[in-house]
Amino acid sequence: ELCDDDPPEIPHATFKAMAYKEGTMLNCECKRGFRRIKSGSLYMLCTGNSSHSSWDNQCQCTSSATRNTTKQVTPQPEEQKERKTTEMQSPMQPVDQASLPGHCREPPPWENEATERIYHFVVGQMVYYQCVQGYRALHRGPAESVCKMTHGKTRWTQPQLICTGEMETSQFPGEEKPQASPEGRPESETSC
């Protein structure tokens, strides 16, 4: 079930998912001057069975000027830079992405991909927050947010994070030492 709202915005902080729950959709967006190939996929979709999850469909971009040249997934080293999204922030290639059952890893970039990724999360997805450079994290609790559903309405829990002052950046889970990121809450209706 899709989350019909966005993770909370925390001043001076960004968020990302360590892994994506099955059902997550990623828009196939192309950078300026390029467009999706005709009959190309609109979205990549995280799908799978009990043992393995992967991204279905392939995003392909072609030059808006030419008709038939297709550009497929060929990651270039210079393309591995961090990307943020309009709707759902999630930088590329997190350091630690545990192979959680029912989750997909960050998809590799495709050629001429837009600079911003737009994810559509599902109920049970967890995202993690960190303070931007120059701000220090004051934790009152977990710096994470989970999409939950109650009475058919979706909402993200409020992360217990305040970013303050002029200090070194805090880190996402797993960036200090490798460890499995916590599994997202089960996708079920919260009791009313």
Epitope: D4, G23, T86, G152, K153
Partner: antibody, heavy 116, light 106 residues
């Protein structure tokens, strides 16, 4: 109480455009996406797309990508949907519906008739 | 796109009858939602997340199912229940609805 009040019925010529409004009250407008749904005469419901009023971000059903443009005005708590290059097949009732999950509140609908 | 197929398209029934409407999704979905619509009116949320009754909906309505097969049941049809019913999925974009089932007087 939550209310979504839509603009009145419109009769338009083929090739023209129309802008339907949906004024929200009784809740925080920017806290919920606003979705639009079409119902052609005697037909079922079709999802057109949504807008996130706080960011202006839109997502469309590909079928309506070149037909509908959804916007929102935070200052008046109003969502809009403009339909362009109208054809007779666009004759339908257009509904706005509050998102955030299931559509628990709907506008009363706006009938757009396209006729020469 | 996930196609939603409702059956039957039209159902003729009498007050007091037990009525069952089925909805099949072309792919597995998390939940099904159901709306009721009367002529000239906007749809009204009836059942959300497969089996939960929306506020003010009588207990004679119930929903069940999982995966690709879902059911809406009215245990004892009342005069106010003659309407068109739509199933709806919001597990993936584009969001889709069934074509509708019209419950009419026999």
């Amino acid at each position: 109480q939550v209310q979504l009040v839509q603009s009145g019925a419109e009769v338009k010529k083929p090739g023209s455009s129309v802008k339907v409004s949906c004024k929200a009250s009784g809740y925080t407008f920017t806290s919920y996406r606003m979705h639009w749904v079409r119902q052609a005469p005697g037909q079922g419901l079709e999802w057109i797309g949504y807008i996130n009023p706080s960011k202006g971000y839109t997502e469309y059903n590909q079928k309506f990508k070149d037909k509908a443009t959804i916007t929102a005005d935070e200052s008046t708590n109003t969502a809009y949907m403009e339909l362009s290059s109208l054809r007779s097949e666009d004759t339908a009732v257009y509904y706005c519906a509050r998102g955030g999950g299931v559509f628990d509140y709907w506008g009363q609908g706006t009938l757009v008739t396209v006729s020469s | 796109d996930i196609q939603m197929t409702q059956s039957p398209s039209t159902l003729s029934a009498s007050v007091g009858d037990r009525v069952t409407i089925t909805c099949s999704a072309s792919s597995s979905i998390s939940y099904m939602h159901w709306y009721q619509q009367k002529p000239g009116k906007a749809p009204k949320l009836l059942i959300y997340t497969t089996s939960n009754l929306a506020s003010g909906v009588p207990a004679r309505f119930s929903g069940s199912g999982s995966g690709t097969e879902f059911t809406l049941t009215i245990s004892s049809l009342q005069p106010d229940d003659f309407a068109t019913y739509y199933c709806h999925q919001r597990s993936t974009y584009p969001l889709t609805f069934g074509q509708g089932t019209k419950v009419e007087v026999k």
